[in-house]
Interface confidence: low
Amino acid sequence: TVPPMVNVTRSEASEGNITVTCRASSFYPRNIILTWRQDGASLSHDTQQWGDVLPDGNGTYQTWVATRICRGEEQRFTCYMEHSGNHSTHPVPS
């Protein structure tokens, strides 16, 4: 088992909104849960966009999940990752 490296980034979207993206990379096996949470509860699927779980060329995998949120509400959102029985939570950078 190779645990993922998780990185959260933010980018400007429309006025008053930002897009937050959570990337998991260099993990094996390929099964992973990656989801955004608001106040600790997972967001619905239709408010998130997922990338495919793809091989990264080193025998491991990578994927991402993104959602759009209101600027100023960043602290309410976290990226949750679960892989091979381990889990972690990752905040939006300020």
Epitope: G40, A41, Q75, E82, T89, P91
Partner: antibody, heavy 122, light 112 residues
Framework: QGQMQQSGAELVKPGASVKLSCKTS????????ISWLKQKPGQSLEWIAW????????SYNQKFTAKAQLTVDTSSSTAYMQFSSLTTEDSAIYYC???????????????WGQGTLVTVSA | DVLMTQTPLSLPVSLGDQASLSCRSS???????????LEWYLQKPGQSPKLLIY???NRFSGVPDRFSGSGSGTDFTLKISRVEAEDLGVYYC?????????FGGGTKVEIK
Amino acid sequence: QGQMQQSGAELVKPGASVKLSCKTSGFTFSDNYISWLKQKPGQSLEWIAWIYAGTGGTSYNQKFTAKAQLTVDTSSSTAYMQFSSLTTEDSAIYYCARHDYYGTSGAWFAYWGQGTLVTVSA
Amino acid sequence: DVLMTQTPLSLPVSLGDQASLSCRSSQNIVHINGNTYLEWYLQKPGQSPKLLIYKVSNRFSGVPDRFSGSGSGTDFTLKISRVEAEDLGVYYCFQGSHVPWTFGGGTKVEIK
């Protein structure tokens, strides 16, 4: 599941402030949301606010925004709630509780501290 | 705020009986993610509350299978199939779908 150990009972005067602590062990503190709740004697529970230990981000019940301030000290895995401008209406037991989110399930108050009794009296 | 109303206020039971507790919310408590965060807690005298049921019908770890939760929308029920002495206390329902999260007033289960 871990432990949540709250500070001891407090007797305070009206108008004063009090800072309650909730020391945790046995789980990764920074991964967790911790809520504080109020229970007056013989009454139901009220949710005050939560704090996400990883960032110190908070969400408050509007009723308590002017009254409560939540903080964390990650070095000691301790959550704090400061309650200010106390009145007799603030006399209650205050609990800290840890949320439980594993996978895509979620339970709000899965693990509780033993509670701290705050008595406001002249 | 979402008002949670529990009935009855007091429920006298005999040990071994089935008990049924009701909880009604003032509005639909489906979260924007599609889940219904309706939970049940038991508080015994002098103790902290303990989680029994989460997301309407899921038993928390270590909770006996005599406890079952059901319901949807605004009407929810907790059933205890055979009441034991350790089940006596005050039961609270709770909604965590809409901020501020709110509790019901409680139902006291006591010996008849």
